[in-house]
């Protein structure tokens, strides 16, 4: 796992530069874990990152994402998906220019390297859920979420909104 | 236009009920969470209930000062919210405002303009 | 539960001044690194407008001169040249857990 001392090389409290045309409202570095508090960890394979789902020991430490958050502005006439309003949406960076990516077409979330300004496969849509949970929507697929699937991170549609609490999109966010 | 339009307030005898209605237009509805709250003549704003998405069934939660006697309740099929009020005393006496939250469940974005209680006898 | 303790109770100022209202929590309002913290603007007989979410983002169509500010316990709108449409009620919330508690209001009046 590298996440720890990757992150610890960002310095700043605030991203300097834009990030498509804006900045982060804020930043906050995490642990991030499954509702079933399994840790979300990243290790260097074959010269490419890995993304796993697992139990770590009693005292191994956790691997830690720097979230930063945007604002966004989101006309229900333009996006056509009758979601209007003021939204959060972050990116997710486990190690320095590295950000979690949602690949639509394999449905899957990977780690790529990446130039800023960030592409918006990059952005998700933040939800607060309730149990203290977030869960996070892929900006480029409307719902389609960050989930769970094989002990891997996967892309999982969520059908309707009912369906929006299963615990399998669902992730816990921890200073420790 | 996003829209909150509430109705079915009234004046009731203490002990009564009613049933408020809140029927939403502009955006799909049942992408988001719904609130009530409410305002006494002259008062600040109270929160009363919220009525949120969930896997199996809608979770709701209360104001310690309603629970038990009020009931919040939706309708996807008729993008509409409601709350129904029993045992109705005059400290409810209030204008009921009907709230979206934003898309994601941050923070309360849309009020509708609020339909008023009046509980005496 | 979550008590918010807004001050002053209300103001007399004029067109132009510089306008501050604070808000205390009584416990941190933080989660996820974001201050669940938000401030409404309330004329009489109309509903409450959103002003400020997440203690420092403006809400839509909102005009630059709300602002705010804080994080955990102390927040803080400013109006930083009340125009004469900003003669109000203003009432802080946070929205971190049920029940999500009010300010009791603070009246902006004119001098």
């Known amino acids: 796992a590298f996440g720890i001392s990757g992150v610890q090389k960002y310095t700043r409290a605030l991203h300097d530069s834009s990030i498509t045309g804006i900045s982060p409202i804020t930043e906050y570095l995490a642990s991030l874990s499954t509702y079933n508090d399994q840790s979300i960890t990243f290790a260097l394979e074959d010269e490419s990152y890995e993304i796993y789902v697992e139990d770590l020991k009693k005292d191994e430490k956790k691997d830690k994402v720097l979230l930063s958050y945007y604002e966004s502005q989101h006309p229900s006439n333009e996006s056509g998906d009758g979601v209007d309003g003021k939204m959060l949406m972050v990116t997710l960076s486990p190690t320095k220019d590295f950000w979690l990516h949602a690949n639509n077409k394999e449905h899957s979330v990977e780690l790529h390297k990446c130039e800023k300004p960030l592409p918006d496969q990059a952005f998700f849509v933040l939800h607060n859920m309730h149990s203290n949970c977030v869960s996070f929507e892929c900006k480029t697929d409307p719902g389609v979420f960050i989930g769970v699937k094989d002990n891997h991170l996967a892309l999982i549609k969520v059908d309707s909104s009912e369906n929006l609490c299963t615990e399998n999109i669902l992730f816990k966010l921890s200073e420790t | 236009e996003v829209q909150l339009v509430e109705s079915g307030g009234g004046l009731v005898q203490p002990g009564g009920s009613l049933r408020l209605s809140c029927a939403a237009s502009g955006f799909t509805f049942n992408k988001f969470w719904m609130n009530w709250v409410r305002q006494a003549p002259g008062k600040g704003l109270e929160w009363v209930a919220e009525?949120?998405?969930?896997?199996?069934?809608?979770?709701?939660d209360y104001a310690e000062s309603v629970k038990g006697r009020f009931t919040i309740s939706r309708d996807n099929a008729k993008n509409s919210v409601y709350l129904q009020m029993n045992s109705l005393r005059a400290e409810d006496t209030a204008v009921y405002y009907c709230?979206?939250?934003?898309?994601?469940?941050?923070?309360?974005?849309?009020w509708g303009q609020g339909t008023l209680v009046t509980v005496s006898s | 539960d979550i008590q918010m303790t807004q001050s002053p109770s209300s103001l007399s100022a004029s067109v132009g001044d510089r306008v501050t209202i604070t808000c205390r929590a009584s416990?941190?309002?933080?989660?996820?690194?974001?201050?669940?913290m938000n401030w409404f603007q309330q004329k009489p007989g109309k509903a409450p407008k959103l002003l400020i979410y997440?203690?420092?983002n403006q809400g839509s169509g909102v005009p630059s001169r709300f602002s705010g500010s804080g994080s955990g316990t102390d927040f803080t709108l400013t109006i930083s040249s009340l125009q004469p449409e900003d003669f109000a009620t203003y009432y802080c919330q946070h929205s971190k857990e049920v029940p999500y508690t009010f300010g009791q209001g603070t009246k902006v009046e004119i001098k």
């Open positions: 997440a203690a420092s």
């Open positions: 009525i949120r998405l969930n896997s199996i069934n809608y979770v709701k």
């Open positions: 709230i979206r939250r934003n898309y994601g469940n941050w923070f309360f974005e849309i």
């Open positions: 416990e941190s309002v933080d989660r996820y690194g974001i201050s669940f």
